[in-house]
Interface confidence: medium
């Protein structure tokens, strides 16, 4: 049965774009208009979960890409990746729950909560060029984003 | 109060079809899947395939060379068609309805039909 | 196409804690679900998404599910309780449920 998907661009509240800086690891820096299209394009698809009001249940994938952003436990933190997945399995609509984040909309922004560690988010740090990761919404770090649609 | 009531055939003969319809009152018909499992008599329960409000369908594997689901939004209704069946067939013939507010899952289901086949 | 196992029967007297476990390959990725089923009638789901309760459905019930295996819990067993128990999870785009567990309320 066919999943639905939407294309965005990701930026965080400092307007930092998202980029890939090496197979499987994401960095958030400031981009000009010159390389403005490095940033990744994400395919956000409608997934199972527990959908609320302010809560949608997504995965995100990397456009043209087998990559979708996946929460684990490593070293007994919990951990933002980027795994690989076979292209004639995913998406679908019941994904792995470490793949599922809850989108939550707070006024003009957008956060995504790991479904399997609630309480953590995707961020991004105060600096450029740092990874993006998943933090528990602590310090300085930024998890409100901007998301500008794209046409598929 | 959402219901599901089902009806078709209860009594076959090997190698002809089973033919279903399940009847949706009440919620909308669009924004959900709609599946149908079987149980036969002291058995566990055997998913057969779903199909949403467009015609899209997903089998199970192995049922899937001999089962057709089909849909007809204009009555809010969904069908099961299952050819070639064999004793091995006899079972109660579930309807149910997925929803997202559950997680995707099957959280209303039709009475039931019992389906024999018997020569 | 994985498999989901249950224990054939369980039995626990009024007022105690019944567990009945559901375990399958990595079924902690997955979410669980669990259906209760009395005899002659539909199943009834009364946990989703591995511990979530569908509304009508009494606090005694509850899930957890983690590594291989998940549970389901109900505390304070009531006689109206004895019935079929059984789990499902999704595996390869296809549902797939447990071989059922036969509650037993003794008394």
């Known amino acids: 049965v066919p999943i639905r998907q939407l294309h965005y661009r990701l930026r965080d509240e400092q307007q930092k774009s998202l980029v890939l800086s090496d197979p499987y690891e994401l960095k958030a820096l400031h981009l000009n208009g010159q390389n403005i299209n490095q940033q990744v394009i994400f395919s956000m698809s409608f997934v199972q979960g527990e959908p609320s009001n302010d809560k949608i249940p997504v995965a995100l994938g990397l456009k043209g890409k087998n990559l979708y952003l996946s929460c684990v436990m490593k070293d007994g933190t919990p951990t933002l990746q980027l795994e690989s997945v076979d292209p004639k399995q995913y998406p679908k609509k019941k994904m792995e729950k470490r793949f599922v984040f809850n989108k939550i909309e707070v006024k003009s922004k957008v956060e995504f909560e790991s479904a399997e560690f609630p309480n953590w988010y995707i961020s991004t740090s105060q600096a450029e060029h740092k990874p993006v990761f998943l933090g528990n919404n602590s310090g300085q770090d930024i998890i409100d984003f901007t998301m500008e649609s794209v046409s598929s | 109060q959402v219901q599901l009531q089902q009806w078709g055939a209860g009594l076959l003969k090997p190698s002809e079809t089973l033919s279903l319809t399940c009847a949706v009152y009440?919620?909308?018909?669009?924004?959900?899947?709609w599946s149908w499992i079987r149980q036969p008599p002291g058995k566990g329960l055997e998913w057969i395939g779903e199909?949403?409000?467009?015609?899209?369908?997903n089998y199970n594997p192995s049922l899937k060379s001999r089962v057709t689901i089909s849909v007809d939004t204009s009555r809010n209704q969904f069908s099961l068609s299952l050819s070639s069946v064999t004793a091995a067939d006899t079972a109660v013939y579930y309807c149910?309805?997925?929803?997202?507010?559950?997680?995707?899952?099957?959280?209303?289901w039709g009475q039931g039909t019992l389906v024999t086949v018997s020569s | 196409q994985s498999v989901l196992t249950q224990p054939p029967s369980v039995s626990v007297s009024p007022g105690q804690t019944a567990s009945i476990t559901c375990s399958g390959d990595?079924?902690?990725?997955?979410?669980a679900f669990w259906y209760q089923q009395k005899p002659g009638q539909s199943p009834v789901l009364v946990i989703y998404?591995?511990?979530k309760r569908p509304s009508g459905i009494p606090e005694r019930f509850s899930g957890s599910n983690s590594g291989n295996t998940a549970t389901l819990t109900i505390s304070g067993t009531q006689a109206l309780d004895e019935a079929d128990y059984y789990c499902?999870?999704?595996?390869?785009?296809?549902?797939?449920f447990g071989g059922g567990t036969k509650l037993t309320v003794l008394g």
């Open positions: 499902q999870a999704w595996d390869s785009n296809i549902e797939v």
């Open positions: 009440g919620g909308s018909f669009s924004d959900y899947y």
């Open positions: 199909i949403d409000h467009s015609g899209s369908t």
């Open positions: 149910a309805r997925a929803s997202p507010s559950s997680g995707w899952t099957l959280d209303y």
């Open positions: 998404l591995d511990n």
């Open positions: 990595k079924l902690g990725d997955k979410f």
